[in-house]
C-alpha cells in the first residue's frame, strides 16, 4: 500500500481492544481545502513506542487504514480511496505494548465536515433566573452550530450538557449554577445540521464561583490604645480560600472572592462620614471609639452573607488632661492640642445611659493657642451638659475628618455638669460625740462622687463661735467621715463640709452647730 492511500488490507497488528482507560480520543476529521482532509486526535498515556493507525470503513463495510506512526494528525486527499461524498466511519487504533487501544468512532460525510472552533476570546458569564448564562461571539464564518458544555466541581468528574442549536453571530448557553462550590466549564462546537460532523476542541476553562460567596470566617483582635490615641485592628484568622476545580487552580479569573471590611464608627455621630469600606488586607488603625465591623464577601454575582462584630469603646480615662473653666458667659474646655489645623469632636453622654444617646459637637479646624491648648466653649443657653449630673466626655481629633480611619482619641474623662459646686454640696451632715475633746462628723456622699475622678477632696471646716477661730480639714474623696479633736467642752462650734473638684471650689453645706457638754465629776 502507498503511504498516501488508505490501505484496504488487514492492519499489521492483531485486532483486539484492550478496553484500557488510556489511548486515543477526541478524533476530529474535516475538509481543510477543496480536495484535502485532515484528521487529528489526542493520545492519553505514555507515548513511547506507540504507533497510530487511522481506520476508515465505507458504508459498504469495506475498511482500510492509514499508518500515522507516532503522529496524532494525518492529512489525505480525496484520491486516497476514502469516500468523501458518502458517509464513512473513522476511528484511531493505537498499537502499544502489545495491545490495541481504540478511539470512539466518528461517522460523517467528510466533504461537508468543516473544522469548527470552540468559543474563542472573551466568554461573558452572568446570572439569569438562578442559572448561569454564558455568551460569546461566534467565530468568523461559523454561524450555525451545535454547542455542548462540560462542567466539574472540585469533587466531581466532568458532566456533559447541551446548549442546543445556535444560529446567530453571538452564541449563548444556559448552564447549572452551583450554590456553594466553584465550577469549571468548557465549551465545544460543531457544524449544525451536518450529520456526524466533528466536535471542535474544548475551549479554555471558564471558572465560575458559587452563587453564594463563602461566609467569611474571620476573627479580629484590637490592640491597646497607643499614645497617639489610636489602636490597631488585627486579623487573627484569615478567611478560608475557596476550593477550585483542577483547571481553575492558579490563575482563575472569575472565581475570585473579595473580602471587604466595613467600618461603622458609632461614637461622635455628628461627624460627616460614619462608615468606610476597606479591603480586608489593609487592616486599619482605629480611635478608641466604639465601632461595628462587618466583613462582606462578594464575587462576580454580588455580595454574600456578612459577619459582624462590635468593638467596644476604650474606656480608659485621663482625669487630668481636661481643664474646664466655668464663667458667667458659659463654659470652656481646654486640652493639649494634637497638631495644627485639627478638627475635634467633643462627645458627651450622661453616665449610665445608653450609648446611643450621646451628644456631640464638631469644632472648626483649629490651631493650638499660645499655651499649646485646644479649646471648646459653650454658653449656658445651649443647654450642653447643663443638667446637674455626671457626663462621660470623649474628645476625638482628626486632620481629615472626612476619613473615618484617621480619627484618634485625645482623651476620655468624666465631668459633672450644671452648677457642680452647688450640686456637689454634701448633705445630711451629722456630728456625734467621740471622746471628751473630739467629735465624729459624717455626711452623705456628694453627687460629685458618682463621677469618677471629678471629686478631688472634701473639706471639713470647724469654727469656734467664741474665738471665731476656723480650722479646715481635707478629707480623701473616698471618705465621708472625719474626727475633729482638740475641742473644748462647753464651747459652741459650727461645722460645714464642701466638695471640691480639680478646677472648682465647692459650696459649703449648711452650718451644723454642736458643743461638747461639760462633764461634772461626782
Amino acid at each position: 500500500c502507498r503511504t498516501s492511500e488508505c490501505c484496504f488490507q488487514d492492519p499489521p497488528y492483531p485486532d483486539a481492544d484492550s478496553g484500557s482507560a488510556s489511548g486515543p480520543r477526541d478524533l476530529r476529521c474535516y475538509r481543510i481545502s477543496s480536495d484535502r482532509y485532515e484528521c487529528s486526535w489526542q493520545y492519553e498515556g505514555p507515548t513511547a513506542g506507540v504507533s497510530h493507525f487511522l481506520r476508515c470503513c465505507l458504508s459498504s463495510g469495506r475498511c482500510c487504514y492509514f499508518a500515522a506512526g507516532s503522529a496524532t494528525r494525518l492529512q489525505f486527499s480525496d484520491q486516497a480511496g476514502v469516500s468523501v461524498l458518502y458517509t464513512v466511519t473513522l476511528w484511531v487504533e493505537s498499537w502499544a505494548r502489545n495491545q490495541t487501544e481504540k478511539s470512539p468512532e466518528v461517522t460523517l460525510q467528510l466533504y461537508n465536515s468543516v473544522k469548527y472552533e470552540p468559543p474563542l476570546g472573551d466568554i461573558k458569564v452572568s446570572k439569569l433566573a438562578g442559572q448561569l448564562r454564558m455568551e460569546w461571539e461566534t467565530p468568523d464564518n461559523q454561524v450555525g452550530a451545535e454547542v455542548q458544555f462540560r462542567h466539574r466541581t472540585p469533587s466531581s468528574p466532568w458532566k456533559l450538557g447541551d446548549c442546543g442549536p445556535q444560529d446567530d453571530d453571538t452564541e449563548s448557553c444556559l448552564c447549572p449554577l452551583e450554590m456553594n462550590v466553584a465550577q469549571e466549564f468548557q465549551l465545544r462546537r460543531r457544524q449544525l445540521g451536518s450529520q456526524g460532523s466533528s466536535w471542535s476542541k474544548w475551549s479554555s476553562p471558564v471558572c465560575v464561583p458559587p452563587e453564594n460567596p463563602p461566609q467569611p470566617q474571620v476573627r479580629f483582635s484590637v490592640e491597646q490604645l497607643g499614645q497617639d490615641g489610636r489602636r490597631r485592628l488585627t486579623l487573627k484568622e484569615q478567611p478560608t480560600q475557596l476550593e477550585l476545580p483542577e483547571g481553575c487552580q492558579g490563575l482563575a479569573p472569575g472565581t475570585e472572592v473579595t473580602y471587604r471590611l466595613q467600618l461603622h464608627m458609632l461614637s461622635c455621630p455628628c461627624k460627616a462620614k460614619a462608615t468606610r469600606t476597606l479591603h480586608l488586607g489593609k487592616m486599619p488603625y482605629l480611635s478608641g471609639a466604639a465601632y461595628n465591623v462587618a466583613v462582606i464577601s462578594s464575587n462576580q454575582f454580588g455580595p454574600g452573607l456578612n459577619q459582624t462584630w462590635h468593638i467596644p469603646a476604650d474606656t480608659h480615662t485621663e482625669p487630668v488632661a481636661l481643664n474646664i473653666s466655668v464663667g458667667t458667659n458659659g463654659t470652656t474646655m481646654y486640652w493639649p492640642a494634637r497638631a495644627q489645623s485639627m478638627t475635634y469632636c467633643i462627645e458627651w453622654q450622661p453616665v449610665g445611659q445608653d450609648g446611643g444617646l450621646a451628644t456631640c459637637s464638631l469644632t472648626a479646624p483649629q490651631d493650638p493657642d499660645p499655651a499649646g491648648m485646644a479649646t471648646y466653649s459653650w454658653s449656658r443657653e445651649s443647654g450642653a451638659m447643663g443638667q446637674e449630673k455626671c457626663y462621660y466626655i470623649t474628645i476625638f481629633a482628626s486632620a481629615h475628618p472626612e476619613k473615618l480611619t484617621l480619627w484618634s482619641t485625645v482623651l476620655s474623662t468624666y465631668h459633672f455638669g450644671g452648677n457642680a459646686s452647688a450640686a456637689g454640696t454634701p448633705h445630711h451632715v451629722s456630728v456625734k460625740n467621740h471622746s471628751l475633746d473630739s467629735v465624729s462628723v459624717d455626711w452623705a456622699p456628694s453627687l460629685l462622687s458618682t463621677c469618677p475622678g471629678v471629686l478631688k477632696e472634701y473639706v471639713v471646716r470647724c469654727r469656734d463661735e467664741d474665738s471665731k477661730q476656723v480650722s479646715e480639714h481635707p478629707v480623701q474623696p473616698t471618705e465621708t467621715q472625719v474626727t475633729l479633736s482638740g475641742l473644748r467642752a462647753g464651747v459652741a462650734y459650727t461645722v460645714q463640709v464642701r466638695a471640691d473638684t480639680a478646677w472648682l471650689r465647692g459650696v459649703w453645706s449648711q452650718p451644723q452647730r454642736f458643743s461638747i457638754e461639760v462633764q461634772v465629776s461626782d
Epitope: 485486532d15 481492544d17 478496553g19 481506520r55 470503513c57 463495510g61 475498511c63 458517509t87 466511519t89 476511528w91 481504540k102 478511539s103 470512539p104 468512532e105 466518528v106 461517522t107 450529520q195 456526524g196
Partner: nanobody, 115 residues
Framework: EVQLVESGGGLVQPGGSLTLSCTAS????????MGWYRQAPGKQRELVAA???????NYADSVKGRFTISRDNAKNTVYLQMNSLKPEDTALYYC?????????WGQGTQVTVSS
C-alpha cells in the same frame, strides 16, 4: 475478552413481531457502531441493520420500514425490533460490531417465520 450474547428469537407467524436483544462486553460499547446480521441456511451472512455511536441508523433494503435498530449504552445492549415479519426473514440472527465485524461471534438467536 469480547462477548456477544443474543436473545429474543422464536417461532412467529407471518405478520407477527419480535424484539431481539444483544448484550456486549469486553470493549467500550458506547464508542462502537453496532450491527445486526443474519444468515439463512445455505446463504452468506448479511448486514440487516446498523447503528452508529451517535445513533444514526441504516438498513438493508429488504427490511426498511419493518425493522428498527436501537441501543442503550447504559446497558451495553443493542436491540432489533422486527415487525411485519415474512417467511424470508427466517434465519439465525447475530449482533456484532459494525466496523469491521469481529472474529468473535455470539451463538446467535434463531428466528423462524412460519404459519
Amino acid at each position: 475478552e469480547v462477548q456477544l450474547v443474543e436473545s429474543g428469537g422464536g417461532l412467529v407467524q407471518p405478520g407477527g413481531s419480535l424484539t431481539l436483544s444483544c448484550t456486549a462486553s469486553g470493549f467500550r460499547f458506547s464508542d462502537r457502531s453496532m450491527g445486526w446480521y443474519r444468515q439463512a441456511p445455505g446463504k452468506q451472512r448479511e448486514l440487516v441493520a446498523a447503528i452508529t455511536v451517535g445513533g444514526s441508523t441504516n438498513y438493508a433494503d429488504s427490511v426498511k420500514g419493518r425493522f428498527t435498530i436501537s441501543r442503550d449504552n447504559a446497558k451495553n445492549t443493542v436491540y432489533l425490533q422486527m415487525n411485519s415479519l415474512k417467511p424470508e426473514d427466517t434465519a439465525l440472527y447475530y449482533c456484532n460490531r459494525r466496523y469491521p465485524p469481529d472474529d468473535y461471534w455470539g451463538q446467535g438467536t434463531q428466528v423462524t417465520v412460519s404459519s
